[in-house]
């Protein structure tokens, strides 16, 4: 599987999440149609059920087994690390600031009167 | 839980990451220890294997439940989604942001105060 | 304002040394600080930087030898690791803008 | 990127003009990300031009840059004997690694 390339500034990995993923993950994981107590916590189909929202390429519609849901969860883990291994680009400096003038030292005001003979 | 923030250019999450797990992930899918075929993955202890070696804080010593271990993966995938979907680092000087960066949609990112109980 | 760079001397090959960068008038909060380094009689080197908030950016050769940090509110580092006579050199630290430079300080590896 | 400056040494007699060219293997941040300095024997350098053509607060106006993208050029008019020195380009990328680099230097003979 190929390593996620940057797209506008963010990465398909990213870019593909669907709305409704980023809405749950928005939402301190609570998927927008239901408001199901913690104790709901140790279903693991609850969590399946979470992981097809929140992994691109496990649509709710299809019929996966929870092994293929696993196989592409690591998939995806995988490259999710391989892109944040790679350093972000950065810029090469910040803003230019001037020096205050009056604290200009005197090399850096070059005098008139030393621009006439080659010593 | 706090977002990640830059450290050293790399972030957080990448950095707690353990240098077997990043071996791993360079590797696509293969443990250093292992040269399994894919077709093991299909045994689902060994995606819950696969599953501990890829995500920082389910160490492999500790006795965890499988629905222990999917919320982990959940939160997880929540936090590198997190991170991803933060521009990178910029200018500190806004004219100058490239227009990738200054272009990323609302949508795209990620509320940080999330958590992902398996609702 | 302005930077001083300190802790160049003689060592020999393999060798750790930490140079220092400190700044005058100015907090390195609110700046990136680079080190540049000039070999005698050779052309300048961007080695990296330090940004305001930490971030660290680093020449291609010099990742993994050379280390950047920020020790206080007007001192940087660079630890440099498995020094050879290559690394000779004069190295300065600048200020964001490189319009501030310090003197430099001569580092020599020599057997 | 590789930055490839005007071979040295470039010779300019009192009152004439020096061209200096620094050319970029590819587009500098913004296009205009490109700074000249001048250097003398046993002195850090010294900024003369930041983003492309403006000038460093308290340096003569007899100095000019010029360019975009990937072709650059500072020019001396009205070249004074104390123009004498190394002139650098300092490209800069928004990128990994390798965010500055150096041109290889071009030295000024004034005669």
């Known amino acids: 599987m190929k390593a996620l390339s940057p797209v506008r500034g963010c990465y398909e990995a990213v870019c593909c999440l669907s709305e409704r993923s980023l809405a749950i993950a928005r939402g301190r994981g609570k998927s927008p149609s239901t408001e199901e107590p913690l104790s709901l916590l140790d279903d693991m189909n609850h969590c399946y059920s979470r992981l097809r929202e929140l992994v691109p390429g496990v649509p709710r519609g299809t019929q996966l087994s929870q092994v293929e849901i696993l196989q592409r969860v690591i998939d995806y883990i995988l490259d999710l690390q391989v892109v944040l291994a790679e350093p972000a680009p950065g810029p090469p400096d910040g803003p230019h600031l001037p020096i205050q003038t009056a604290e200009l030292t005197p090399e850096l005001v070059i005098s008139k009167d030393k621009r006439s003979f080659c010593h | 839980m706090k977002a990640l923030s830059p450290v050293r250019g790399c972030y957080e999450a990448v950095c707690c990451l353990s240098e077997r797990s990043l071996a791993i992930a360079r590797g696509r899918g293969k443990s250093p220890s292992t040269e399994e075929p894919l077709s093991l993955l299909d045994d689902m202890n060994h995606c819950y294997s696969r599953l501990r070696e890829l995500v920082p804080g389910v160490p492999r010593g500790t006795q965890l439940s499988q629905v222990e271990i999917l919320q982990r993966v959940i939160d997880y995938i929540l936090d590198l989604q997190v991170v991803l979907a933060e521009p990178a680092p910029g200018p500190p000087d806004g004219p100058h942001l490239p227009i990738q960066t200054a272009e990323l949609t609302p949508e795209l990112v990620i509320s940080k105060d999330k958590r992902s109980f398996c609702h | 304002q302005s930077v001083e760079e300190s802790g160049g001397r003689l060592v020999t090959p393999g060798t750790p040394l930490t140079l220092t960068c400190t700044a005058s008038?100015?907090?390195?909060?609110?700046?990136?600080i680079h080190w540049v380094r000039q070999a005698p009689g050779k052309a300048l080197e961007w080695i990296g930087y330090i940004s305001d908030g930490g971030t660290t950016y680093y020449a291609s050769w010099a990742k993994g030898r050379f280390t950047i940090s920020k020790t206080s509110s007007t001192t940087v580092d660079l630890k440099m690791t498995s020094l050879t006579t290559e690394d000779t050199a004069t190295y300065f630290c600048?200020?964001?803008?490189?319009?501030?430079w310090g003197p430099g300080t001569l580092v020599t590896v020599s057997l | 990127a590789v930055l490839t400056q005007t071979p040295s040494p470039v010779s300019a007699a009192v009152g004439g003009t020096v061209t200096i060219s620094c050319q970029s293997s590819q587009s500098v941040y913004n296009n205009n990300w490109l700074s000249w300095f001048q250097q003398k024997s046993g002195q850090p350098p010294k900024l003369l031009i930041y983003?492309?053509?403006k000038l460093e607060s308290g340096v003569p106006s007899r100095f000019k840059g010029s360019g975009s993208g990937t072709q650059f050029t500072l020019t001396i008019i009205d070249v004074q004997c104390d123009d004498a020195a190394t002139y650098y380009c300092?490209?800069?990328?928004?990128?990994?690694?390798?965010?500055?680099?150096f041109g290889g230097g071009t030295e000024v003979v004034v005669k």
């Open positions: 983003e492309t053509s």
């Open positions: 600048a200020r964001q803008g490189f319009n501030i």
């Open positions: 008038g100015f907090s390195l909060s609110s700046y990136y």
């Open positions: 300092l490209g800069g990328y928004w990128t990994t690694s390798d965010n500055n680099i």
